[in-house]
């Protein structure tokens, strides 16, 4: 359109100059840009009442580059486009859409979710955790000797964070109530920290029973267990054996 | 004369990470975008997905989007395409390429990936 | 995706006869007039040429012995008379819809 009425003003004003400025291949006086050199944009530019033609070397925001083999000009985005390749093409939409396979979409079709961050329909992402850690070693109060009834944890990492719409992280922490053999801390060994220590193995028979969290238990002076007689005690470890309670931070 | 020079070869372990450079010269670097194209081996060719130098917006063909990131380095008129998580079907030749009014008349030499254990 | 089909996989054609290549779109890839496809030529060891842009117009510098046809879904690639440098694989390629696609070639060897 814009280029049949270039072409027609061409032929109609008899002041054609081969002396242009700016890109332009023809021009006129008065009309400006009649023709422009290879790679560059045809586009009219109101000035005025007056329209003159000029040659850009890319196309204005809104506008995408046409090809044809006599002039090559600058169409319009669709309204709801602000930058495209083409109509069906485009690379970001207007405030208010989402962009998703080149259409701009009031809302993201299902199974996608909007990041109001890109403007665009994404895929939903699931949380994804690690495998568990090893226990750690079976502590209280930080030290691995000198009572019966301590904790260990473990934790795991979290690989991938899930989007809005994706699936919550589960625990990533996790503790349970463990038995030691109880023996006496040696010269020195006093408050030395679990990670310091090598494990012990609990002895045949002993069990390890999950609890909420350390702090519940380091609360209480004293666990009411280590004051039944070894009868009650078996009694009490087949019932709580695998209990296995977590706690974590929701992510 | 517009020329898009491309980095040279590349030989990389499974997992790794690696990124390839195109270097345009004899126009305007922020005038057109550039795309990037996968061809496997005398096969075919595959979009991976666009970046405007001038402002940095990129998109991406939905089956490249995880793993592919189209970056520019407008002060040295350069794009690049990285791509993570190698596996071996990634083993292709890659083209960077100018898109002008819906095609690409411009194009790299190609850089060829290897991905080998 | 729009899925571009072509055929023939391979042809062989004497010199100075004509090859023609077809190129299938599973869907329309016009839009407001134009058609948004393109002809490309590609020889071993180097990046492909466009030779055809928006489905009839010759690149500059392409011998007019190629030419393309066609419009909505039906594409054609003709070459006439054959050279012995047009040896290559043919790729058709559509830009109207994302994700851009390309067709999967057709080789053109001369008998």
């Known amino acids: 359109q814009n280029a049949s009425r270039g072409r027609r003003q061409r032929r109609m004003h008899p002041n054609v100059s081969q002396g242009c400025q700016g890109g332009c291949a023809t021009c006129s006086d008065y009309n400006g840009c009649l023709s422009c050199k290879p790679r560059l944009f045809f586009a009219l530019e109101r000035i005025g009442m007056k329209q003159i033609g000029v040659c850009l070397s890319s196309c204005p925001s809104g506008y995408y580059g046409t090809r044809y083999p006599d002039i090559n000009k600058c169409t319009k985005c669709k309204a709801d486009c602000d930058t495209c390749f083409n109509k069906n093409f485009c690379t970001k939409c207007k405030s208010g859409f989402y962009l998703h396979l080149g259409k701009c979409l009031d809302n993201c079709p299902e199974g996608l979710e909007a990041n109001n961050h890109t403007m665009e329909c994404v895929s939903i992402v699931h949380c994804e955790v690690s495998e568990w850690n090893p226990w750690s070693p079976c502590t209280k109060k930080g030290k691995t000797c000198g009572f019966k009834r301590g904790t260990e944890t473990r934790v795991r990492e979290i690989i991938q964070h899930p989007s809005a719409k994706g699936n919550l992280c589960p625990p990533t922490n996790e503790t349970r109530k463990c038995t030691v053999q109880r023996k006496k801390c040696q010269k020195g060994e006093r408050g030395k920290k679990g990670r310091e220590r090598k494990r012990k193995k609990p002895n045949k028979g002993e069990s390890k029973e999950a609890i909420p969290d350390s702090k519940s238990l380091e609360s209480s002076k004293e666990i009411p267990e280590q004051r039944e007689n070894k009868q009650q005690q078996k009694k009490r470890k087949v019932q709580d054996k695998q209990k296995s309670v977590s706690v974590s931070t929701v992510h | 004369q517009v020329q898009l020079k491309q980095s040279g070869p590349e030989l990389v372990k499974p997992g790794a990470s690696v990124k390839i450079s195109c270097k345009a010269s004899?126009?305007?670097?922020?005038?057109?975008?550039i795309h990037w194209v996968k061809q496997n081996h005398g096969k075919s060719l595959d979009w991976i997905g666009y970046?405007?130098?001038?402002?940095?917006?990129?998109g991406y063909n939905q089956k490249f989007k995880n793993r592919a990131t189209l970056t520019v380095d407008t002060s040295y008129s350069t794009a690049y395409l990285e791509v993570r998580r190698l596996t071996f079907e990634d083993s292709a030749v890659y083209y960077c390429?100018?898109?002008?009014?819906?095609?690409?008349?411009?194009w790299g030499q190609g850089t060829t990936l290897t991905v080998s254990s | 995706d729009i899925v571009l089909t072509q055929s023939p996989a391979s042809l062989a054609v004497s010199l100075g006869q004509r090859a023609t290549i077809s190129c299938k779109a599973s869907q329309s890839v016009d839009y407001d007039g134009d058609s948004y496809m393109n002809w490309y030529q590609q020889k071993p060891g180097q990046p492909p040429k466009l030779l055809i842009y928006?489905?009839?117009n010759l690149e500059s510098g392409i011998p007019a012995r190629f030419s393309g046809s066609g419009s909505g879904t039906d594409f054609t690639l003709n070459i006439h008379p054959v050279e012995e440098e047009d040896a290559a694989t043919y790729y058709c390629?559509?830009?109207?819809?994302?994700?851009?696609?390309f067709g999967a070639g057709t080789k053109l060897e001369l008998k």
């Open positions: 928006a489905a009839s």
């Open positions: 390429a100018t898109y002008f009014a819906n095609n690409f008349d411009y």
């Open positions: 004899g126009y305007t670097f922020t005038d057109y975008s």
């Open positions: 970046i405007y130098p001038s402002n940095g917006d990129s």
């Open positions: 390629q559509q830009s109207n819809e994302d994700p851009l696609t």
